[in-house]
């Protein structure tokens, strides 16, 4: 099906700013520096193609990508199918975040990306440092006290952590729109569950201790578990599709070159190991440093602390997929009753993990709801 791909989309070689301006949208690019020195690229689409004349403050919407991904996820389809452009055209001030370690967040004031120290992070640090730094920056820049937060996949994970542990940050979130939410991964069918019993020393031995490349570990599973589904050598070697799963039925294959050229955008081996710990434990908790002594050094306790989503009072709307391998419906089922301020939930029976960002019918199934919920919030 996609065995021989001839890149036809110019966005294949573009950065985020170029992708935005290519479609005729205004773009502002900023660098946000976190407390621990990571430099994150943040992009802004301040208005849409047809509403630049509208004066007054526009509600701010911040989009946060998921695991192994980047801000390009929100602008990889045609404008009428990409959430960032849809929101801009609907009159919102749209901001796109990047998590440390990805293509657009691979610099640090103190460490080179060639060093092991640079890659010593997991989603804990994204929640503790990246989100507060980015949200504080947006709040200062726009002069608005609150913003709407849209997260996908790990973007919801770091939202759950940040907004339940950092009350002053939580106050800045008007509504949390969670797409394919991930807290526990007890029931995940993703190939990351194959890694759950690999000890840390062996994990690092196989994958190294810097950026995560899938290596040849996953090859043994692909023929039977991924690629037999009418698939193709190109997707089969891509870590994002390997880990998140794939289904061609709802997928614009003409955009595949864009998806593949921008993904996986990179994360740390430590982050991937954290995810395997979560699969093994079935709990939503901080990174386990491997021994009670090391955990005490980091947490003042012998076990990594649990994250308590019941402490998050931010209003939250949730969309999940019935065919999602990573955010399994059973895990979502465990999450929903713990959310004290759940205002909306929709399960899309045929959706998988990546459909929330790339499906051809995502506007009808998800995005239009978000646009109208934000506009209701305005009143």
């Amino acid at each position: 099906l996609f065995g021989k791909l001839h890149p036809g989309s110019p966005e294949v070689t573009m950065n985020i700013s170029q992708m935005i301006t290519y479609w005729g949208y205004p773009n502002e690019e900023y660098e946000v520096v976190t407390e621990d020195g990571y430099i994150l690229e943040v992009n802004r689409i301040p208005y849409g193609k047809k509403n630049s004349g509208n004066t007054g403050q526009r509600p701010v919407v911040f989009l946060q990508h998921g695991l192994l991904a980047s801000a390009t996820n929100w602008i990889s389809n045609l404008p009428n199918n990409s959430l960032a452009f849809i929101l801009a055209d609907a009159g919102y001030d749209v901001w796109l975040g990047n998590s440390r370690g990805n293509t657009w967040a691979r610099r640090n004031l103190y460490y080179s990306p060639d060093s092991v120290e640079f890659w010593a992070f997991s989603f804990d640090e994204m929640a503790k440092y990246d989100l507060p730094a980015t949200i504080d920056f947006i709040v200062k820049k726009t002069g608005q006290k609150q913003l709407h937060y849209v997260g996908h996949s790990q973007g919801t994970t770091i939202g759950f952590i940040a907004f339940s542990t950092n009350p002053s940050l939580a106050k800045r979130i008007k509504t949390f729109y969670a797409l394919a939410p991930v807290a526990t991964v007890k029931y995940t069918k993703s190939l990351i569950n194959k890694l759950r019993f690999v000890p840390q020393s062996l994990f690092k031995f196989i994958f190294g201790d810097k950026i995560f490349y899938p290596h040849n570990f996953f090859d043994q599973f692909l023929a039977t578990e991924v690629c037999s589904r009418e698939m193709l050598n190109l997707l089969c070697s891509n870590a994002l599709f390997i880990i998140c799963g794939f289904d061609s039925k709802n997928f614009n294959t003409s955009r595949l070159d864009v998806y593949l050229s921008h993904n996986p955008a990179g994360t740390s081996v430590q982050n991937m190991f954290h995810w395997t710990q979560a699969v093994k434990s079935g709990k939503f908790q901080a990174y386990d440093w491997g021994s009670p002594v090391q955990n005490r050094m980091h947490y003042d306790q012998s076990q990594p602390p649990y994250y308590n989503v019941t402490a998050m009072n931010v209003p939250i709307a949730v969309w999940n997929g019935g065919k999602d391998l990573l955010a399994d419906p059973q895990d979502v089922g465990l999450l929903l009753p713990k959310l004290p301020n759940l205002i909306y939930h929709k399960e899309i029976p045929f959706y998988n993990h990546l459909d929330f960002i790339w499906a051809m019918d995502a506007p009808q199934e998800v995005y239009n709801d978000i646009v109208s919920m934000i506009s209701e919030d305005k009143k």
Partner: nanobody, 115 residues
Framework: QVQLQESGGGLVQTGGSLRLSCAAS????????LSWYRQAPGKQREPVAA???????TYADSVKGRFTISRDNIKNTMYLQMNSLTPEDTGVYYC?????????WGQGTQVTVSS
């Protein structure tokens, strides 16, 4: 519960060779990763070689070009061929297997390289 049992260790002179074997009580064909670890005197146990189900291998820098990990699915046995041994290779060698149900260890076999 898979049981693993190493054999083939012993005393060898510098420059010599040994072949370690690891026999499994169950199928090693279903293991995602087969590995050999070394615990040198006074040090932590660390991996020296790993073999993925796909057939790809990874070696510690200190043994690259000298050690070879392999498997025989019919005999349910994995091997570590060790050539050009040096005193730094001395230690207890453990085989390990990682599969869908867990990570399994052997009891270890002593390898001593004399100068």
């Amino acid at each position: 519960q898979v049981q693993l049992q190493e054999s083939g260790g012993g005393l060898v002179q510098t420059g010599g060779s040994l072949r370690l074997s690891c026999a499994a009580s169950g199928s090693i064909g279903s293991m995602y990763v087969l590995s050999w670890y070394r615990q040198a005197p006074g040090k932590q146990r660390e991996p020296v070689a790993a073999l993925m189900g796909s057939g790809s291998t990874t070696y510690a820098d200190s043994v690259k070009g000298r050690f070879t990990i392999s498997r025989d699915n019919i005999k349910n046995t994995m091997y570590l061929q060790m050539n050009s041994l040096t005193p730094e290779d001395t230690g207890v060698y453990y085989c390990a297997g990682t599969g869908a149900e867990g990570h399994y260890w052997g009891q270890g076999t002593q390898v001593t390289v004399s100068s």
